[in-house]
Amino acid sequence: FSGDGRAVWSKNPNFTPVNESQLFLYDTFPKNFFWGVGTGALQVEGSWKKDGKGPSIWDHFVHTHLKNVSSTNGSSDSYIFLEKDLSALDFIGVSFYQFSISWPRLFPDGIVTVANAKGLQYYNTLLDSLVLRNIEPIVTLYHWDLPLALQEKYGGWKNDTIIDIFNDYATYCFQTFGDRVKYWITIHNPYLVAWHGYGTGMHAPGEKGNLAAVYTVGHNLIKAHSKVWHNYNTHFRPHQKGWLSITLGSHWIEPNRSENTMDILKCQQSMVSVLGWFASPIHGDGDYPEGMKKKLLSILPLFSEAEKNEVRGTADFFAFSFGPNNFKPLNTMAKMGQNVSLNLREALNWIKLEYNNPQILIAENGWFTDSHVKTEDTTAIYMMKNFLSQVLQAIRLDEIRVFGYTAWSLLDGFEWQDAYTIRRGLFYVDFNSKQKERKPKSSAHYYKQIIRENGFSLKEATPDVQGQFPCDFSWGVTESVLKPESVASSPQFSDPYLYVWNATGNRLLHRVEGVRLKTRPAQCTDFVNIKKQLEMLARMKVTHYRFALDWASVLPTGNLSAVNRQALRYYRCVVSEGLKLGISAMVTLYYPTHAHLGLPEPLLHAGGWLNPSTVEAFQAYAGLCFQELGDLVKLWITINEPNRLSDIYNRSGNDTYGAAHNLLVAHALAWRLYDRQFRPSQRGAVSLSLHADWAEPANPYADSHWRAAERFLQFEIAWFAEPLFKTGDYPAAMREYIASKHRRGLSSSALPRLTEAERRLLKGTVDFCALNHFTTRFVMHEQLAGSRYDSDRDIQFLQDITRLSSPTRLAVIPWGVRKLLRWVRRNYGDMDIYITASGIDDQALEDDRLRKYYLEKYLQEVLKAYLIDKVRIKGYYAFKLAEEKSKPRFGFFTSDFKAKSSIQFYNKMISSSGFPSENSSSRCSQTQKNTECTVCLFLVQKKPL
């Protein structure tokens, strides 16, 4: 007997995945993996007193203990609608169907005499139909529905008389059905039978408080199972050649602190007191776990040596149940002060270590949804995906011998103490309907797909391509607002006098009279901050640097009456010094953040972007910047992420849309000004950058989610792109959606009406498309009331825990960027596109492997868009140069300017212009890469500061 389970908790507690394969395995299950689905007789059969069926303890318990439930009759009526169940099984394509026989349907008072004919006919028909369809039956003899007569006459499982009666019942089933059944389960989850039936009273027969009874029941269940196993082994296995086990259920638990021995011992104790209670005698050494014997002393019945030998090894495989029933209610669980967890992979590892690597059938797995959820059970898909991913990793990575999986349950039905308040089926059943149609839920479609593919195939990805970006591709890095230094930090060359130090021994400087030195003019390198920026940029080896000006520093009053020349000089220095390194600037005029709107104080106090005067002020500010810096700057962004800024004005949807309107007009006016006044001489390009995450339907089987994903893109990107890139007006889809909500009284929001003049003003005011892309969001439709932008969209987001994601929960989904680029081209035509910010937060301060993985995978998808989809992608700007203190770590440099290892990785990307094949050399010489700014360099050298 092994008993090594405790080692499971010694894994590295600080492990955070840095690539997808460490978190989710795209792979198949073993050939001939056994895929199935399960039900319990009491839960789905209905007809609780029809055709001679006797009452069970649960039929009685429902009437006496459960509020608002009259009987189990309202369930899915499988007894009547057998054909519908068979069609449902056909739909999914399972290899097996696990169901239970209702003991009182065969023998109404529990004693084996002549079987109830109608009951016998039902199970015979079911078995024959399964065999005909090539679906293997896995039959459970006891799934909690003890004949009431046995409870009333003997006290149920408290009385060891039941052991022989159960064995008689099992013998009948082996004799009658064994020719068609190769897999038998004696008892489903005996822990719950004992613990909730006799401890908490939450299950039938509803007795509670008597711990001795709990462990007596457990003892009798083990002995009953053992007796049946020996019976099958001796009398039936030789000719029926089947397998028999008992389904044991458990939770999983994680230590509060993985290095605290006592926490780990408590976790072990927790598992042993639930799963070990039954598994230790049956799969272990024939006896209860040591810890239980020590703790429970006289309460726990003893096994004699003969009984230990009798019980030990009485299972042909380990049948394991992992579902909500073992996690409810939390206050009755054996948590030992530790943390309950749904980590099925770890639970399987524990079983492997504790019970010597048995063959495992997952005999029940799944979660639940609320009763109001019909066929769109999106969370159920993700729970299933997560569980199946863990099973696959257990098989492939941990070498655990799982040979089959039972999704629970086939149908919605009666859920024990929860009655009809939750649903666990892959098929939706309206319990109030006459015909009880089985409607496949999204989870049924998903499971069907898993079975068809025998696992998880990587559908989303086109294989990686080898190739390079064009030679004039902008390899950039983005920084947010650069705060200008108000005073040059090195004024030592502006004083014309000569000094001697310590001439009289007083350690002071003495001016030498009559000597005047030539001072040198102020230089850009006087700004210490700029030196830091340049050092970092030089190490990045980028061709472009995107940074933002601080509007409030340049124009403290918000108008041209007080221009901060020192600030402008500082920015000019940043650009000119960069050009000396061959780095061109992409300058953002206005870069608001959620914490700080970045507006000059007077404009902020006047209402910010809700006040049209801010629009005029912005135009004037833009003109000043074009005039002062435009000879050196050839790429301009007017406003960074106006589609996010407007969120700040979220008191109402109308505020949001009003602010957005003013931002659009401000941008358009700035663009028109540049076009008219500056483009002829400066020959630059102007745009605005939009936050542009991609959206996928959280539930690909739900039309409403596909519509929600497109709606997200309309509300997020098209809201600004449509007026500027295309029509001069807001997207029709967005306008109509808000209007329809308005009409139905669900929102008082309305998009502003644009005049013909405004439409003409807005339309076409972009020279390129600038997108900030970080992640892909999984969206679902949810009707939301209220008059805010967020509720107008009727969208909720779902976090897929099986996806690699960053500390701030940004999912790493590389293919999203390619889909975005294709969507933009399809909607707005063939234009130059720059990804003006793209990056991930990574906790690592030195070896930021998540960032490297992100860069590699996202750039690979951008390259596919360029090479395969022919998208005119002109540049990629990684976000961001340096991180800010106590903010998410997006930087290539730490807040104290220490370089991270992703810098070398990005350098290599830049020097090879992408992903060249091994034998191809870099096609681009350094001069070609920076063709854009030979003129700029000339100007830098000639123009005084």
């Epitope: 405790r6 080692a7 602190r257 290095e259 605290n260 021995t261 926490d263 780990i264």
Partner: antibody, heavy 118, light 107 residues
Framework: EVQLVQSGAEVKKPGASVKVSCKAS????????INWVRQAPGQRLEWMGY????????EYNAKFKGRVTITSDTSASTAYMELSSLRSEDTAVYYC???????????WGQGTTVTVSS | DIQMTQSPSSLSASVGDRVTITCRAS??????LAWFQQKPGKTNKLLIY???TLQSGVPSRFSGSGSGTDFTLTISSLQPEDFATYYC?????????FGGGTKVEIK
């Protein structure tokens, strides 16, 4: 470098108490436990008890219960073991050792000799 | 308490020899046994835990095996720095207990 540095040798009279300290460095003190083990001349090693610094979980060997007290001062990254009602058979080298989750000791102190003699 | 019996209590060997030390528990301790090395003037050094897991930084000539009640520490090719006393410790249940030690001396 992860290390545990213990206080110096002590000579005590029977009936007195001794308090041995163990200063940790090179790792996050609160993430691990400290065990105390002693080795009397010619005797085998004997585990006395354990403290998990993060939440002050303490477990004592029943043999020493009532006589041994294990404490810690997180601000000083130091664990202490106090043994009272000393007798001559308590003469031993006392070790502190960092405890890992599975109950093994991966870093040991250099040992503190305690002599109990009248 | 679980009694740990180590054998032999001492042995003489030469550099390059294969050395085996055994440790027996009075009842099953699963695989939760650690081995460590004690040398005068040095701090004790963990070699193996959980029966067979080599502690990081420990040379691969050290290996552990066994489970239940019988365990073995093997040094595949004895090196000059390996002459020391070796102890086993069960870390299966409180109180943790130790073997009596095996002194490995130069032949």
């Amino acid at each position: 470098e992860v290390q545990l540095v213990q206080s110096g040798a002590e000579v005590k009279k029977p009936g007195a108490s001794v308090k041995v300290s163990c200063k940790a460095s090179g790792y996050t003190f609160t993430n691990y436990g400290i065990n105390w083990v002693r080795q009397a001349p010619g005797q085998r090693l004997e585990w006395m008890g354990y403290i998990y610094i993060g939440n002050v979980d303490i477990e004592y060997n029943a043999k020493f219960k009532g006589r041994v007290t294990i404490t810690s001062d997180t601000s000083a990254s130091t664990a202490y073991m106090e043994l009272s009602s000393l007798r001559s058979e308590d003469t031993a080298v006392y070790y502190c050792a960092r405890g890992r989750g599975l109950g093994h000791f991966d870093v040991w102190g250099q040992g503190t000799t305690v002599t109990v003699s009248s | 308490d679980i009694q740990m019996t180590q054998s032999p209590s001492s042995l003489s060997a030469s550099v390059g020899d294969r050395v085996t030390i055994t440790c027996r528990a009075s009842k099953s301790i699963s695989k939760f046994l650690a081995w460590f090395q004690q040398k005068p003037g040095k701090t004790n050094k963990l070699l193996i835990y959980s029966g067979s897991t080599l502690q990081s930084g420990v040379p691969s000539r050290f290996s552990g095996s066994g489970s239940g009640t019988d365990f073995t520490l093997t040094i595949s090719s004895l090196q000059p720095e390996d002459f020391a006393t070796y102890y086993c410790q069960q870390h299966n249940e409180y109180p943790w207990t130790f073997g009596g030690g095996t002194k490995v001396e130069i032949k």
